[in-house]
Interface confidence: medium
Amino acid sequence: DPNAPKRLPSAFFLFCSEYRPKIKGEHPGLSIGDVAKKLGEMWNNTAADDKQPYEKKAAKLKEKYEKDIAAYRAKGKPD
């Protein structure tokens, strides 16, 4: 079976992974919901050029995932 990652992350998910610890560090009292809200606002206010690295990484991960599935499907026959 494909050695697929647990989740295919979006550009926004990758952005959140990077900035969530920073927000928590700066605002330790914020609830999970408030952190998510702040991350959403930050993403919406991020310029298209600055979003590009995250979008590129997400596209690369999607490509890898598709290759994993393709490699699995090329393996052979039913049991």
């Epitope: 079976d1 494909p2 990652p5 647990k6 295919l8 599935i69 699995y72 026959k77 039913p78």
Partner: antibody, heavy 117, light 109 residues
Framework: EVQLLESGGGLVQPGGSLRLSCAAS????????MHWVRQAPGKGLEWVSG????????EYADSVKGRFTISRDNSKNTLYLQMNSLRAEDTATYYC??????????WGQGTLVTVSS | QSALTQPPSVSAAPRQRVTISCSGS????????VTWYQYFPGKAPKLLIY???QRPSGVPDRFSGSKSGTSASLAITGLQAEDEADYYC??????????FGGGTKLTVL
């Protein structure tokens, strides 16, 4: 013996919701990609959605994207299809199918979903 | 409209040979395996041919599959009354997506 048993079909009004289940037995469910395929009356087979063994990766046909959600519970050996904002064109027999290497080697007997007012 | 193109119907007399075509593109059949299913309405589809030309155990050798470029075909020789059914070709695209043909109704005259 491999068995796939769908349930949850029925009559629902346009705009309504249904949740289909597929109980799997006779194989190690958690190791296989699983899919939903449907056949509308008088039409051909149409792939609806697929999900990888971990459950973390899913894909949908354009016709159901944003309305249907596929999921699985490997501890219960069960595949699900949550169908929201149902339309008349979603009326079909829905089959769950086990994939191995790109083909479906086992299918359930299907459950009928009728969307009508 | 289906991603793979099949004739809606074919017919032949018992003991004759019949072929069902399936046409696709480089994104599916051209680069990926083709599978054929036999389908009796109201029943579960049955895997007939996989990996273009392989037969699962239990499928008679009267059934055979072939592929060339972006097209595939299913051949049935020594046609029998019980072969009257719907036949579907299937391949796949990128990721998890799967594509089917529109299906071909086989009538045994």
């Amino acid at each position: 013996e491999v068995q796939l048993l769908e349930s949850g079909g029925g009559l629902v009004q346009p705009g309504g919701s249904l949740r289909l289940s597929c109980a799997a037995s006779g194989f190690t469910f958690s190791k296989y990609i699983m899919h939903w395929v449907r056949q509308a009356p008088g039409k051909g087979l149409e792939w609806v959605s697929g999900i990888v063994p971990s459950g973390g990766l899913t894909e949908y046909a354009d016709s159901v994207k944003g309305r249907f959600t596929i999921s699985r519970d490997n501890s219960k050996n069960t595949l699900y299809l949550q169908m929201n904002s149902l339309r008349a064109e979603d009326t079909a027999t829905y089959y769950c199918a086990k994939e191995i290497f790109g083909q479906f080697d086992y299918w359930g007997q299907g459950t009928l979903v009728t969307v009508s007012s | 409209q289906s991603a793979l193109t099949q004739p809606p119907s074919v017919s032949a007399a018992p003991r004759q040979r019949v072929t069902i075509s399936c046409s696709g593109s480089t994104s599916n059949i051209g680069n990926n395996a083709v599978t054929w299913y036999q389908y009796f309405p109201g029943k579960a589809p049955k895997l007939l041919i996989y990996s273009d030309n392989q037969r699962p155990s239990g499928v008679p050798d009267r059934f055979s599959g072939s592929k060339s470029g972006t097209s595939a075909s299913l051949a049935i020789t020594g046609l029998q009354a019980e072969d009257e059914a719907d036949y579907y070709c299937q391949s796949y695209d990128r990721g998890l997506s799967v594509v089917f043909g529109g299906g071909t109704k086989l009538t045994v005259l």
